[in-house]
Amino acid sequence: ASTQSPSVFPLTRCCKNIPSNATSVTLGCLATGYFPEPVMVTWDTGSLNGTTMTLPATTLTLSGHYATISLLTVSGAWAKQMFTCRVAHTPSSTDWVDNKTFSVCSRDFTPPTVKILQSSCDGGGHFPPTIQLLCLVSGYTPGTINITWLEDGQVMDVDLSTASTTQEGELASTQSELTLSQKHWLSDRTYTCQVTYQGHTFEDSTKKCADSNPRGVSAYLSRPSPFDLFIRKSPTITCLVVDLAPSKGTVNLTWSRASGKPVNHSTRKEEKQRNGTLTVTSTLPVGTRDWIEGETYQCRVTHPHLPRALMRSTTKTSGPRAAPEVYAFATPEWPGSRDKRTLACLIQNFMPEDISVQWLHNEVQLPDARHSTTQPRKTKGSGFFVFSRLEVTRAEWEQKDEFICRAVHEAASPSQTVQRAVSVNPGLAGGSAQSQRAPDRVLCHSGQQQGLPRAAGGSVPHPRCHCGAGRADWPGPPELDVCVEEAEGEAPWTWTGLC
């Protein structure tokens, strides 16, 4: 068993069970759940004499941890005296110590109810310059209470002289006020009113509420990205739980496989959102082969605030497959932005919708943050399409004027990737690439070519690819500008872009 520090509990009798003429009385201290031996128990008896006896440690059956009791017998004016039991456990650390201070006996008492009330917002729903918190400690048997205010668990320096106590019948109530600046209140800190009474602690906490009521908790389970699956060959799936109210209860996420086979070790991350809610993500590495062969993975979510467990399942998408078509083009120079250009990539007619898009320059993959790619949208047919946008600088294109848009998709053959290159200055004859305004929509074509063939290869228009007037009879998608290049000795190919 690993090292475990003890839990310490005072042992006292009920005051009504101690005869009023008793000249001596015994109290005790229990140290339990520690490992290994030993613990050292000492007593502070104040001005009184006392004899102590520490019983041999016993082993707790289930855990193998130890428990021991130390007894203190005192005589004299014990009724008004407080006693401290000091437990040290050097195996935990050389300075590990727990002190418990208590009286000889415990009276029957009604514990207090602790409630924090806060001052209202103004009529417009805004916070005033100062916020008052009122701690109501009510309904307890009269006796000494200590009130402490905490800010994010740290004791605050507060003037407690304002605390007032009233008695109603046999029970007492006390209230303490804390004034905070608006800045402190809006800083999202937690304020706690902590009450110590009869050796017990009672508390209530409050903080600025979230700006909006969180919706019900939602859970989502992602499929692995094609890039992770086919290129990196280390696919992961992520279970995402959003809109949790922060609380003492933790979110429990359990992974399983429909086949019953064991799952890998998952990693977990918790993030507090600006609206006060909590987002929890758990990422599970999955086997490439397991995924491709159709294994179903399940994420089960439980939490005290969830009425019922939530289950999310994910597996490889079924249905027809179609490889993506990739078209890359550069926007023309725009007034006032000579040192920057936007490259665009249209990827379309792929199925299923899972796709990864990357941009490369100088054979190096650019960071994902450099480009912006839309979510897959359905085409009018049965496939999907995405657009990806990349901003490039003059320094980059002057270093090497070739940028590659690459799509990773399971239906692309032979290696699950399709890519097209695009240049900022493709050197088109006709010169409209350098135009100072957005060009009219045109079709680019070679003089000799009569039909529009399917794209067979290549990436950017060749200098022999001429810009011509748009032709309504030209086949192909009407919303795109298409360039046909006559390749020597090969099938012609298309380039889609702006001339």
Epitope: R215, G216, T302, P307, A309, L310, M311
Partner: antibody, heavy 119, light 110 residues
Framework: QVQLVESGGGLVQPGGSLRLSCAAS????????MTWVRQAPGKGLEYVSI???????WYANWASGRFTISRDNSKNTVYLQIDSLRAEDTATYYC?????????????WGRGTLVTVSS | DIQMTQSPSSVSASVGDRVTITCQAS??????LAWYQQKPGQPPKLLIY???TLASGVPSRFSGSGSGTEYALTISSLQPEDFATYYC????????????FGGGTKVEIK
């Protein structure tokens, strides 16, 4: 096998109270969220309340205040306390077990106990 | 709260017929639509969960489909024992929800 047996129903006067019990056997009660569903004679199913594995509970809007769900895992029993009974509470009350893996509905139902509210 | 609207409220059909019952949710359901069958004097029985997964022991003539807000239960070839009332349930509420059951569809003999 999994069994849920409801008891505690019967004829009660308006304004009275009842405590329905659901004895569970054949599975580990503490692993399952538990639900009470009721069905008025000739009508559809109506969700009343759910208690999760942590012992926290939720109620349908109309049930809040008069209905109290609780569970005692050591006794393998789930309870539904109904106060201030009204004629419209007349129904068969079903105790039901939510699937363990979650968000997949109710996989086992008791046979129900009939509550009749009438003067 | 998500409301579940089931239609039709009743349907008359013959043995061997294909019967489809629909259930519309007032908001999208991410996961967890269930279908139940109930016969007179009996508790409901789980048929389908997670939109389309057949519960244990349920004949393959029952199938569930749909996503978002539109769901359907289809009985491909109605059998004598299938004459009953069917309920859909939004089984995925992660917060307080009022009635999570549809109003029910009674499948009667024509």
């Amino acid at each position: 096998q999994v069994q849920l047996v409801e008891s505690g129903g019967g004829l009660v006067q308006p304004g009275g109270s009842l405590r329905l019990s659901c004895a569970a056997s054949g599975f580990t009660l503490s692993n399952h969220d538990m639900t009470w569903v009721r069905q008025a004679p000739g009508k559809g199913l109506e969700y009343v309340s759910i208690i999760n594995t942590y012992g926290n509970h939720w109620y349908a809007n109309w049930a809040s205040g008069r209905f109290t769900i609780s569970r005692d895992n050591s006794k393998n029993t789930v309870y539904l306390q109904i106060d201030s009974l009204r004629a419209e509470d007349t129904a068969t009350y079903y105790c039901a077990r939510e699937t363990h893996h979650g968000s997949s509905g109710i996989d086992h139902w008791g046979r129900g106990t009939l509550v009749t509210v009438s003067s | 709260d998500i409301q579940m609207t089931q239609s039709p409220s009743s349907v008359s059909a013959s043995v061997g017929d294909r019967v489809t019952i629909t259930c519309q949710a007032s908001e999208s359901i991410y996961s967890g639509l269930a279908w139940y069958q109930q016969k007179p004097g009996q508790p409901p029985k789980l048929l389908i969960y997670d939109h389309s997964t057949l519960a244990s022991g349920v004949p393959s003539r029952f199938s569930g489909s749909g996503s978002g807000t539109e769901y359907a239960l289809t009985i491909s070839s109605l059998q004598p024992e299938d004459f009953a009332t069917y309920y859909c349930q939004h089984a995925d509420y992660a917060h307080h929800s009022d009635n999570v059951f549809g109003g029910g569809t009674k499948v009667e003999i024509k």
